[in-house]
């Protein structure tokens, strides 16, 4: 899903108040909900017909400094036999997330907002068929 | 996939430099990528074995203001013949994200990060047996 | 018109690898399977695997896995069959075809002839 | 994988007169999704192969309907209802609903 552009209203103080100077904002140290937690049913990167594997990105300027991006593993989907079914597609689910990106030069650190697209797993689906012309 | 806890020394100046004052950073307006694209086929929550809905939550204070959620429609899969299979599970995919929740009192407004779970969408599994002892 | 059409005869040594590529035109390229199927000379037809030009998925058939690579480049409408560890019974015209999901292989490349030989 | 057995593996047809080709698989080619994902294929000398027939009996366009198919479930057949001298060349039947997708060995066809 694609978040939608900030227009950068939503980073400005109110019209009535007296402009953010020099392009920046205050960000409060600490996250909310930092302890939320994942409740995904056991590898189901590996139980589903659309099975992916997982490759990890580190990059220590970025918070979280891992993200984690999965690849389907077949251009079909498994079938009941456990075989290849090409009549049906692996397709990746992508989601749009925030990630905080650190600049600094010596003892000046600032941050910044970037965009980063995640594939977090895969799906079967019927394929749109373009049938024989 | 699980965002780390950030232990908070992500957002803390080398040692060697003076602390951030108040528990405050500096956030640059601006969203890096802020064109970055989504290319998920068409139509996949409706396609897929394991199809889902979307339900939006709108937040003003929270950027992005729009956060869209996934719903398997069902408790089995789709077969070939477009009937439910409960011999399969539809599963949600989860992610954690971040967004940026806005706090104002007046003309004086903070950000602070704060971790959203997403259900991005569901794909189709065999179920975990647990065989009768 | 639907086209595709593949790069020129190559001639290669046993052991090495070759890259045949197939560029697409007159369709939406990301709407439709890339198939590669070969044939040796005087001889059948034989499946190598698909690919999804979309994704970048890949099915192989199990008796080339280990050595078959199929890539894509949107940008420019091709796609990559490469061939690893060439053997002299790797001899033969590559094809890569147009599959539409269930229907059939309904457009062909013209062909490109891999030779191996010491 | 599946086995695709041709007869006869040559003919020889004089123009104007029909001709059949039989095509039998090691496994039924009935998919889950109760389509049959059986294809026919004729290769001219010096030329790619062309798609004639999809899914059993549905002709591609373009091809003329002195070619028919048949079939169901492991046994299929192509018939040319009166051979002409262009339709000489290697006839392929073929499966995709198993992978790997697997041909037939092949028919020439030859004119008397």
């Known amino acids: 899903r694609k978040i939608p552009k900030v227009g950068h209203t939503f980073f400005q103080k109110p019209e009535s108040c007296p402009p953010v100077p020099g392009g920046s904002m205050k960000l409060d140290i600490g996250i909310i909900n930092e302890n939320q937690r994942v409740s995904m049913s056991r590898n189901i990167e590996s139980r589903s017909t659309s099975p992916w594997n997982y490759t990890v990105t580190w990059d220590p300027n970025r918070y979280p400094s891992e993200v984690v991006q999965a690849q389907c593993r077949n251009l079909g989907c498994i079938n009941a036999q456990g075989k290849e079914d090409i009549s049906m597609n692996s397709v990746p689910i992508q989601q749009e997330t925030l990630v905080v990106r650190r600049k600094h030069q010596g003892c000046s650190v600032s941050f910044q907002l970037e965009k980063v697209l995640v594939t977090v797993g895969c799906t079967c689906v019927t394929p749109v068929i373009h049938h024989v012309q | 996939r699980k965002i780390p806890k950030v232990g908070h020394t992500f957002f803390q100046k080398p040692e060697s430099c003076p602390p951030v004052p108040g528990g405050s950073m500096k956030l640059d307006i601006g969203i890096i990528n802020e064109n970055q694209r989504v290319s998920m086929s068409r139509n996949i929550e409706s396609r897929s074995t394991s199809p889902w809905n979307y339900t939006v939550t709108w937040d003003p204070n929270r950027y992005p203001s729009e956060v869209v959620q996934a719903q398997c429609r069902n408790l089995g899969c789709i077969n070939a013949q477009g009937k439910e299979d409960i011999s399969m599970n539809s599963v949600p995919i989860q992610q954690e994200t971040l967004v940026v929740r806005r706090k104002h009192q007046g003309c004086s407004v903070s950000f602070q990060l704060e971790k959203v779970l997403v259900t991005v969408g569901c794909t189709c599994v065999t179920p975990v047996i647990h065989h009768v002892q | 018109q639907f086209q595709l059409v593949q790069s020129g005869a190559e001639v290669k040594k046993p052991g090495a690898s070759v890259k045949v590529s197939c560029k697409a035109s007159g369709y939406t390229f990301t709407d439709y399977n890339l198939n590669w199927v070969r044939q040796a000379p005087g001889k059948g037809l034989e499946w190598m695997g698909v690919i999804h030009p979309d994704y970048g998925t890949t099915s192989y058939n199990q008796k080339f896995k280990d050595r078959v690579t199929m890539t894509v480049d949107t940008s420019t409408s091709t796609v990559y069959m490469e061939l690893s560890s060439l053997r002299s019974e790797d001899t033969a015209v590559y094809y890569c075809?147009?599959?539409?999901?269930?229907?059939?292989?309904?457009?062909w490349g013209q062909g490109t002839l891999v030779t191996v030989s010491s | 994988d599946i086995v695709m057995t041709q007869s006869p593996l040559s003919l020889s047809v004089t123009p104007g007169q029909p001709a059949s080709i039989s095509c039998r698989s090691s496994?039924?080619?009935?998919?889950?999704?109760?389509?049959?994902?059986l294809h026919w294929y004729l290769q001219k000398p010096g030329q790619p192969p062309q798609l004639l027939i999809y899914?059993?009996?549905n002709r591609f366009s373009g091809v003329p309907d002195r070619f028919s198919g048949s079939g169901s479930g492991t046994d299929f057949t192509l018939k040319i209802s009166r051979v002409e001298a262009e339709d000489v060349g290697v006839y392929y039947c073929s499966q995709s609903t198993h992978v790997p997708l697997t041909f037939g060995q092949g028919t020439k066809l030859e004119i008397k």
């Open positions: 899914k059993v009996s």
């Open positions: 496994q039924s080619l009935v998919h889950s999704n109760g389509n049959t994902y």
């Open positions: 075809v147009r599959y539409d999901y269930g229907d059939a292989m309904d457009y």
